[in-house]
């Protein structure tokens, strides 16, 4: 058998780091038996046998120009073996971050924090962690560990299914080369790092006979479970073309009607998505629908103002992307106090 | 030899913006994190922001957080800093440094001075 | 983020004399801590890694100790050149921070 430790990595490579003193081991003899060494294609002897280092061969402070092919062979002229030399740095330990677009899952994405210049590999998992005591504040490491599946195709992500809202999670990301392992833990709890996709499905229609409303409407995002518990909010902006300040409006539901548009002019709107009791951050925006405003031609009959009405949220349909969830507040009224000088004009 | 060069400072109005370049060399600047401390004038040392090697991932103070972005050209060994809506606050001595495991700051450039006043 | 403490904030010292600056961060570290000495008008130099390591060319009257929250940083006989402002510093997380720092002068 090799008297050769293997590393992890490629077969008949060994390694060393730049500036360190490095032995390479010569495969095919026995331990201890006297060997000489060559460089590949080069006659010049590097190390006798009468070295005193048996089948190892010794450079101090190897460098770049160390790297390449070493042939061994042994006191009868027969191939000890050959050994490629690769010079690298042991891993740092990486950036790792974690996000969640849901409440039920969460991927970690990781990068080297240095490179190493070896062949590495990333070992993955979590613990969830539990308070120690009812008494205590301490928090440790309790049930796991598990793997965190990682993406196939090489992606530098792994995802974590079926984690629970509340629990908080240490996760383990290592980066292994030939040189060693290095170790980065990072807790994350779901409350923090939940950031769902933004809405989709935004809509921007205008209203007849009002040249100043646009109704928006959207829906909750795709990879949003479909279950009621936990329930998104909203952040609608919008403002007429060629204008640099958005206005924003917080909905009460999956609609908003625009009351204060600019007659006349495309409006470009956005909406973002946030849990409703605000853990985590906003989703990024979703991208901007645009509409006009109608022209505002006067409706067959506009009833009395006393006479308007509301009407209740339309509940989505069971196929909808959004979730059946319950009707936070009815539409936004189709006239309120800042209409009077819209509806003047309508009228006139 | 082994550097790092730091320009882009002066003096800025509060609200305005400033992109600082740090220029490395003498070592193989696409294989090492790169970040930015500052040091506000008498005052100590306040990390500001790191990038990894391939820029994938950014990291930064709270205090910086959606004003300043950090990026890095491996091409032209070049870390940036670009800075928008600075306060007086911002005012500081900007250094460059060059990290072993993300926070061990081995080398370091001599800073530009950023001053936010009106 | 993990605060980190600093005492003395300044200390006077003669030539000769062993100085000791402590630092205290507000969790545990896992031994991912620097010191730094900065002089005037200079950018920072790093002397201690990991607590204990001394940096490539330091000289080794610089030395570390401590783990988890509490750390010593000692100058065994304290020379002219090492007036300056030492700051500790932790890794231990992927947002470092500085304790105060520490100005030494000779008396």
């Known amino acids: 058998s090799s008297p050769c430790p293997q590393a992890w990595g490629p077969p008949g490579v060994q390694y060393g780091q730049p500036g360190r003193s490095v032995k390479l081991c010569c495969p095919g003899v026995t331990a201890g038996d006297p060997v000489s060494w060559f460089r590949d294609g080069e006659p010049k002897l590097l190390q006798g046998p009468d070295s005193g280092l048996g089948h190892e061969l010794v450079l101090a402070q190897a460098d770049s120009t160390d790297e390449g092919t070493y042939i061994c062979q042994t006191l009868d002229g027969a191939l000890g073996g050959t050994v490629t030399l690769q010079l690298g740095y042991p891993p740092a330990r990486p950036v790792v971050s974690c996000q969640a677009a849901d409440y039920e899952n969460f991927s970690c994405t990781w990068s080297p924090s240095q490179i190493s210049g070896l062949p590495t590999r990333y070992l993955t998992s979590y613990r969830k962690k539990t308070v120690l005591g009812a008494d205590s504040q301490r928090r440790s490491p309790s049930t796991g560990p598990w793997p965190c599946p990682q993406d196939p195709l090489g992606a530098a992500r792994c995802v974590v299914h079926g984690a629970e809202f509340w629990s908080q999670y240490r996760i383990n990301v290592t980066e292994v080369n030939p040189l060693g392992a290095s170790t980065r833990l990072l807790d994350v709890s779901l409350q923090s790092i939940l950031r769902p996709d933004p809405p989709q499905g935004l809509r921007v229609e205008s209203v007849p006979g009002y040249p100043r409303r646009l109704r928006a409407s959207w829906t909750y995002p795709a990879s949003w479970p479909c279950q009621p518990h936990f329930l998104l909010k909203f952040r609608l902006q919008y403002r007429p073309a060629q204008h640099p300040a958005w206005s924003t409006v917080e909905p009460a539901g999956l609609e908003e009607v625009i009351t204060d548009a600019v007659a006349g002019l495309p409006h470009a709107v956005r909406v973002s998505a946030r849990d409703f009791l605000d853990a985590g951050t906003w989703s990024t925006w979703s991208p901007e629908a645009w509409g006009t405003p109608s022209t505002g031609t006067i409706p067959k009959e506009i009833p009395a103002w006393g006479q308007l009405h509301t009407q209740p949220e339309v509940e989505p349909q069971v196929d909808s992307p959004a979730p059946p969830r319950p009707s936070l507040q009815p539409h936004p009224r189709l006239l309120d106090h800042r209409d009077s000088v819209e509806q003047v004009a309508v009228l006139a | 030899e082994v550097q790092l060069l730091e320009s882009g400072g002066g003096l800025v109005q509060p609200g305005g913006s400033l992109r600082l370049s740090c220029a490395a060399s003498g070592f193989t600047f696409s294989w090492y994190s790169m970040t930015w401390v500052r040091q506000a004038p008498g005052k100590g040392l306040e990390w500001v922001s790191s990038?990894?090697?391939?820029?994938?991932?950014?990291q930064y103070a709270d205090s910086v957080k959606g004003r300043f972005t950090i990026s890095r050209d491996n091409s032209k060994n070049t870390l940036y800093l670009q800075m928008n809506s600075l306060r007086a606050e911002d005012t500081a001595v900007y250094y460059c440094?060059?990290?072993?495991?993300?926070?061990?700051?081995?080398?370091w450039g001599r800073g530009t001075l950023v001053t936010v006043s009106s | 983020d993990i605060q980190m403490t600093q005492s003395p904030s300044s200390l006077s010292a003669s030539v000769g004399d062993r100085v000791t600056i402590t630092c205290q961060a507000s969790?545990?570290?896992?031994?991912?801590l620097n010191w730094y000495q900065q002089k005037p008008g200079k950018a920072p130099k790093l002397l201690i890694y990991?607590?204990?390591n001394l940096q490539t060319g330091v000289p080794s009257r610089f030395s570390g100790s401590g783990s988890g929250t509490d750390f010593t940083f000692t100058i065994s006989s304290l020379q002219p050149e090492d007036i300056a402002t030492y700051y500790c510093q932790q890794y231990d997380n992927l947002s470092p921070t500085f304790g105060p720092g520490t100005k030494v002068d000779i008396k």
């Open positions: 990991d607590a204990s």
């Open positions: 440094a060059k990290p072993v495991d993300w926070g061990r700051f081995d080398l």
């Open positions: 969790q545990d570290i896992n031994n991912y």
């Open positions: 990038i990894v090697p391939s820029g994938g991932h950014t």
